[in-house]
């Protein structure tokens, strides 16, 4: 593929001397894979990110790139290495014909190759500005700590760094990696080029309309004057941040990614690496009124993904589209008619809408939390953001029906005090992807590396499922749900908690022979029950109900259907205490709930009995929800009786530790 500008100096033909024979053969049984954006108009064929295996050194990356050039030259193709990645992901960016992909996939060290694709600013209308003065009294909002210990990196358009709102707060780095603007008649007008980034910088740290008024920012230009960038440019930007962090370690870092493109394995992988290096990444869920899991970086589990709500806490509609939703969204934040710095003049303000603005709010809140508690890990920060959010205020009817249960009903809020939440036992609910409908399909939900999986449940809209179980995978417990024959698929639901110094294990009882049902308890000294799961091989458990739900005096026990194996999650942690709370309804009902009291945190949520008319159980904040089939299809037999079982825990150790600090 010829480059129109003929920019091929150190290209390729000189590399013919490098012999194919020098290549180490790829390991047997491992095949590199090729990925490309599912949204055709966003694809950028001709540019590819070649991702190498994790332990590949820079010298090997360079050698692999040269080998590709030599082999391509031998076939008469020109190629150009645009960038060699190191620091975050090993690999390189190459401009070449798609004809060479088969060749490239066979190179040594290659893990996968991804075709480059576009990413976009997530504000509407980000260049049709409505100049408005700030519409509030500044003294209504004067936070105790403005995030002064934190640096926020903004990957966006260029910005007007001397706007009165942000002057002296934003350091414009020399990083720029943007595609050419579309259209031959495009006129670059500075104020339009700067519009999106200036507004977001103002929302994060603006003097008068900012969330974290003390936060300092650094901007990287990865979006052009039309608000468009590339996955590769964003990757190189993230690598730049990692290298800056290594060269000059500062305090906590927050990276704001107010952009979205189609699902990208490589962009998600880079975000994961940066997050594991201690950086907090916050991103826009996307403005496509769609499942956020179909977009990147929104779909990266390590990133805090933010949807947009309006002043009435309703999901934001943006033209014919609106905020994204689904299990990949962590929480929502204000994203409609947000006042911020306008690049039209140094004192102008403008209102913009979108998930970019929502993400900027959360980046600001994160900066303030980290400034107050600089040692917070990503997991701790995410749990606090969730904990302090306004709960159950979003009208879920706006979301597609199948997404309502998966979408968190949380709107970000500043903690009442930035200190003193340390005593709380924090937990969150993590939904898996849908398993798909095949008979043996399973779905897996995972917690973050420094979270503990305290319980596991499952849910199926058809009710055809074979339960769930906790199992070890790569040294960590995961939650796996099992589909049943004729089922439309299942979800696994993990309850992920912050429990320092915890030692957790799973105790399993196989299906019981007797009619009493299956039971399992935590028999180790000092271990308490945090969750119960049940899994069965039979297609339909029938109507058997254990005569006794839980024998008195044995709170550390899980009980279940005699044909099911029962799994108890048993944990030992300093000062951890748990109790079981049940709410049974004799008549059939579509939903049964039981909540933990103030000061206690829901760690486990399950249903009794495990019969097939129960669709599943899941935790929503501190409430255990058990869903059953539509009452009209069940009839009002005793089969309809369902009990929701909550396990509520608290940590006396954490409470004492926080009292000692105060």
């Amino acid at each position: 593929q010829e480059d129109e500008d003929g920019d091929y100096e150190e290209l390729v033909l000189a590399l013919r001397s490098e012999e194919d024979g020098l290549a180490e053969a790829p390991e047997h049984g491992t095949t590199a894979t090729f990925h490309r954006c599912a949204k055709d108009p966003w694809r950028l064929p001709g540019t590819y990110v070649v991702v190498l295996k994790e332990e590949t050194h820079l010298s090997q990356s360079e050698r692999t790139a040269r080998r590709l050039q030599a082999q391509a030259a031998r076939r008469g193709y020109l190629t150009k290495i645009l960038h060699v990645f190191h620091g975050l992901l090993p690999g390189f960016l190459v401009k070449m014909s798609g004809d060479l992909l088969e060749l490239a996939l066979k190179l040594p060290h290659v893990d996968y190759i991804e075709e480059d694709s576009s990413v976009f600013a997530q504000s509407i209308p980000w260049n049709l500005e409505r100049i408005t003065p700030p519409r509030y009294r500044a003294d209504e909002y004067q936070p105790p700590d403005g995030g002064s210990l934190v640096e926020v990196y903004l990957l966006d358009t260029s910005i007007q760094s001397d706007h009165r709102e942000i002057e002296g707060r934003v350091m414009v780095t020399d990083f720029e990696n943007v595609p050419e603007e579309d259209g031959t008649r495009f006129h670059r007008q500075a104020s339009k080029c700067d519009s999106h980034g200036t507004h977001l910088a103002g929302v994060v740290s603006g003097r008068d309309a900012g969330v974290a008024k003390g936060a300092s920012m650094r901007s990287l230009r990865v979006l052009n004057c039309q608000g468009k960038g590339t996955v590769s440019g964003t990757l190189i930007g993230l690598e730049f941040i990692r290298k800056s962090q290594l060269v000059q370690p500062v305090g906590p870092l927050v990276v704001l990614l107010p952009l979205a493109g189609g699902y990208s394995r490589v962009l998600n992988a880079a975000c994961q690496r940066l997050a594991r290096a201690g950086v907090v990444l916050v991103t826009a869920a996307g403005n496509f009124r769609d499942d956020a899991c179909l977009y990147s970086p929104a779909s990266a589990p390590e990133v805090i993904t933010v949807g947009a709500t309006n002043a009435q806490d309703q999901p934001v509609t943006l033209g014919t589209l609106g905020t994204n939703f689904g299990r990949c969204v962590d929480l929502f934040a204000p994203g409609e008619d947000i006042i911020g710095a306008s690049s039209d003049c140094s004192t102008c303000f403008v209102s913009q809408s979108g998930t970019s603005q929502a993400a900027a709010h959360v980046a600001g809140i994160a900066a303030m939390m980290l400034s107050a508690e600089p040692e917070l890990t990503l997991a701790e920060l995410r749990q606090r953001l969730i904990h302090f959010s306004a709960k159950d205020v979003i009208n879920e009817a706006w979301f597609p029906e199948d997404q309502r249960v998966l979408t968190p009903n949380l709107v970000a809020a500043l903690p009442p005090s930035t200190h003193g939440a340390g005593w709380q036992l924090f937990c969150r609910t993590v939904w898996s992807a849908h398993s798909g409908p095949t008979r043996m399909a399973t779905a897996v939900a995972r917690c973050a590396p420094d979270e503990e999986l305290l319980s596991c449940s499952s849910f199926s809209r058809s009710g055809k499922r074979r339960g769930e179980r906790m199992e070890a995978q790569g040294g960590k417990l995961v939650c796996r749900a099992h589909n049943a024959f004729g089922g439309e698929g299942v979800y696994a639901i993990a309850r992920c908690c912050l429990l320092p110094q915890a030692n957790c294990s799973v105790h399993t009882a196989p299906p019981a022979e007797a009619s009493m049902g299956t039971r399992v308890h935590c028999h180790q000294q000092g271990h308490v029950l945090t969750g119960c799961s049940s899994h069965w091989e039979v297609e339909d458990l029938g109507t058997h109900k254990p005569p006794v739900l839980r024998p008195r005096g044995q709170p550390n026990q899980c009980v279940g259907h005699r044909e099911a194996s029962i799994h108890a999650s048993c944990c030992h942690a300093p000062g951890l205490e748990c109790k079981v709370k049940e709410h049974g309804i004799p008549a059939p009902q579509e939903q049964v709930t039981v909540a933990c009291e103030e000061g206690w945190t829901l760690t486990g949520c399950s249903a009794l009995p495990g019969t097939s008319h129960v669709l599943g159980a899941y935790a929503v904040d501190n409430t255990c929800v058990v869903r059953s089939r539509d009452v009209s299809t069940t009839g009002s037999t005793s089969e309809g009786a369902v009990t929701a079982v909550a396990i509520c825990c608290r940590s006396r150790h954490l409470a004492q530790a926080s009292q000692e600090l105060q």
């Epitope: 003065p133 003294d139 004067q142 007007q160 002057e167 008068d208 003049c345 004192t347």
Partner: antibody
Framework: QVQLVQSGAEVKKPGASVKVSCKAS????????ISWVRQAPGQGLEWMGW????????NYAEKLQGRVTMTTDTSTSTAYMEVRSLRSDDTAVFYC????????WGQGTTVTVSS | QSALTQPASVSGSPGQSITISCTGT?????????VSWYQHHPGKAPKVMIY???NRPSGVSTRFSGSKSGNTASLTISGLQAEDEADYYC?????????FGGGTKLTVL
């Protein structure tokens, strides 16, 4: 360290123009605008306007609109402020300062308008 | 733009505390967080002592503090010292400009 260095004193006749310069050093020039402030003898400080060192946009005090022009030269990190049609009541010390916050000030340039 | 209102003069003895007020309107001091205080010794360049209502630049003594309530901002100097004698000006953003106070002459007795 961050510094703003202004040009020397000027004596002008009424109706003439004066152009004061302000050379910045010690920071990234386009990251901050430059404010201009004056102080007439026995009077307080008066804000004259601001110029963006990033894109050259200006914001002038209403009172001076039409008589003042602010410019920058990013290649030399220098800001300029010109006042035309000088009157005797324009006699003042003119200061440049960094940004709207005015956290760093030049040493001042005395402009005397006298016939 | 009419100037912010400051007392023409205040005085205090060494070691005492004094407060200088700066009254504006809901369009300037009341609306914006960007109130600054400048110390001006005759013949020298002004020096920022407080910015954004209550922030102190590095190098400025902790004896200087700022606050705001409604449309009035205040500068407090505790443990007054002879070198504090100077003119003090407040400033605030307005919707599209910056406005200064008339200045307060501080005399250390």
């Amino acid at each position: 360290q961050v510094q703003l260095v202004q040009s020397g004193a000027e004596v002008k006749k009424p109706g003439a123009s004066v152009k004061v310069s302000c050379k910045a050093s010690g920071y990234t020039f386009p990251s901050y605008g430059i404010s201009w402030v004056r102080q007439a003898p026995g009077q307080g400080l008066e804000w004259m306007g601001w110029i963006s060192a990033y894109n050259g946009n200006t914001n002038y005090a209403e009172k001076l609109q039409g008589r003042v022009t602010m410019t920058t030269d990013t290649s030399t990190s220098t800001a300029y402020m010109e006042v035309r049609s000088l009157r005797s009541d324009d006699t003042a010390v003119f200061y440049c300062a960094r940004g709207y916050v005015m956290d760093v000030w030049g040493q001042g340039t005395t402009v005397t308008v006298s016939s | 733009q009419s100037a912010l209102t400051q007392p023409a003069s205040v005085s205090g003895s060494p070691g005492q505390s004094i407060t200088i007020s700066c009254t504006g309107t809901s369009s300037d001091v009341g609306r914006y967080n960007s109130v600054s205080w400048y110390q001006h010794h005759p013949g020298k360049a002004p020096k920022v002592m407080i910015y954004e209502v209550s922030n102190r630049p590095s190098g400025v003594s902790t004896r200087f503090s700022g606050s705001k309530s409604g449309n009035t901002a205040s500068l407090t100097i505790s443990g007054l010292q002879a070198e504090d004698e100077a003119d003090y000006y407040c400033s605030s953003y307005t919707s599209s400009s910056v406005v200064f106070g008339g200045g307060t002459k501080l005399t250390v007795l």
